[in-house]
């Protein structure tokens, strides 16, 4: 999100680790490889981050600018309703979902989409920048 793009916020961009991108006060990691939802969550936690939790429509639009048609896991699960990993409800967007068996959430450039958690997808981690 740095490197002279329109999202560059200041000269302190390199405060995120290698292969992570900075926006505002956060660093984001967009994976290339694919994992199931739980493995993606574990990857993020092992790096002192969490699977992407989106706070509002503005952040969602920003992130979608960086995504292709490929879906990426986010920290969203249907656990007594669609909730982010911190327990807050999904209340600023709808999520496409074909079936109640699809209990994990993913994002691409166009939408949020429910999927079976066992599917292997890319993922996005997020953490507060140093």
């Amino acid at each position: 999100l740095c490197q002279g793009s329109k999202y560059s916020t200041c000269a302190s961009c390199p405060s995120c680790p290698d292969h992570w991108m900075k926006y505002g006060n956060h660093c984001y990691y967009f994976s290339v490889e694919k994992k199931d939802w739980i493995s993606s969550l574990e990857f993020c936690l092992a790096r002192d981050s969490h699977l992407l939790m989106i706070t509002d429509k503005q952040e969602m639009s920003l992130l979608q600018d960086f995504l292709s048609e490929a879906f990426h896991w986010v920290g969203l699960r249907n656990n007594s309703g669609w909730r982010w990993e911190d327990g807050s409800p999904l209340n600023f967007s709808r999520i496409y979902s074909n079936s109640l068996v699809q209990t994990c959430g993913a994002i691409n450039k166009n939408s949020l989409q429910a999927s079976s958690c066992e599917v292997s997808l890319q993922w996005v981690c997020k953490k507060v920048s140093p």
Epitope: G81, P89, L90, R94, I95, S97, N98, S99, L100
Partner: antibody, heavy 119, light 107 residues
Framework: QVHLQQSGPELVKPGASVKLSCKAS????????ITWVKQRPGQGLEWIGW????????QNSEKFKDKATLTVDTSSTTAYMELHSLTSEDSAVYFC????????????WGQGSTLTVSS | VIQMTQSSSFLSASLGGRVSITCRAS??????LAWYQQKPGNAPRLLIS???SLETGIPSRFSGGGSGKDYTLTIISLQTEDIASYYC?????????FGGGTKVEIK
């Protein structure tokens, strides 16, 4: 356009079982959950359970766990609900419905199958 | 299990009048709410999902509103074809649950 065609009225004796059908046409059958809903005469709507045609996974509400068995035949794009150990309380109209694309609300409905349980 | 309560079982209104049908959830449902219309002998028909999103083909005199636990379906100019029962349904949580219904009649 999705169309759900349900089987006709049934008159069955207490203690028996009955199998209702719901044939889907006009869209990919395996894509969305099929749900069953009960409506007793003059009463409201009650969710029975759903089945995901792609893999046959089901979930029933607690009340209907032992009462209803949901199955699908993907080759004929038909969903079935078998009701067991029938009593007069099971006399109702039963609807099949397809879930919406944003969650388990129901955007397409069958016309309903009337079940009468009487000796 | 989230309980859905429609406080009025019956509502009377004049043709051309405004009707507001209310629905209350026992817990927050974050706008994950649908409204249906049902006429005698027919299946329910989806009017609104997501508390406010009108389904394709539904007349614009129908609208939905509300948030949190409290939601409203409004018909701004009642027509004879709107005489029916109306049901709310939450789908925030499994199992999805319906309100008891509100029957709209002509005054």
């Amino acid at each position: 356009q999705v169309h759900l065609q349900q089987s006709g009225p049934e008159l069955v004796k207490p203690g028996a079982s009955v199998k209702l059908s719901c044939k889907a046409s006009g869209d990919t059958f395996t894509t969305y959950d099929i749900t069953w809903v009960k409506q007793r005469p003059g009463q409201g709507l009650e969710w029975i359970g759903w089945i995901y045609p792609k893999d046959g996974r089901t979930q029933n509400s607690e009340k209907f766990k032992d009462k209803a068995t949901l199955t699908v035949d993907t080759s004929s794009t038909t969903a079935y609900m078998e009701l067991h150990s029938l009593t007069s309380e099971d006399s109702a109209v039963y609807f099949c419905a397809r879930r919406g694309q944003f969650g388990p609300y129901f955007d397409h409905w069958g016309q309903g199958s009337t079940l009468t349980v009487s000796s | 299990v989230i309980q859905m309560t429609q406080s009025s079982s019956f509502l009377s209104a004049s043709l051309g009048g405004r009707v507001s049908i209310t629905c209350r959830a026992s817990d927050h449902i974050y706008n994950w709410l649908a409204w249906y219309q049902q006429k005698p002998g027919n299946a329910p028909r989806l009017l609104i999902s997501g508390a406010t999103s009108l389904e394709t083909g539904i007349p614009s005199r129908f609208s939905g509103g509300g948030s949190g636990k409290d939601y409203t379906l409004t018909i701004i100019s009642l027509q004879t074809e709107d005489i029916a029962s109306y049901y709310c349904q939450q789908y925030w949580n499994t199992p999805p649950t319906f309100g008891g219904g509100t029957k709209v009649e002509i005054k």
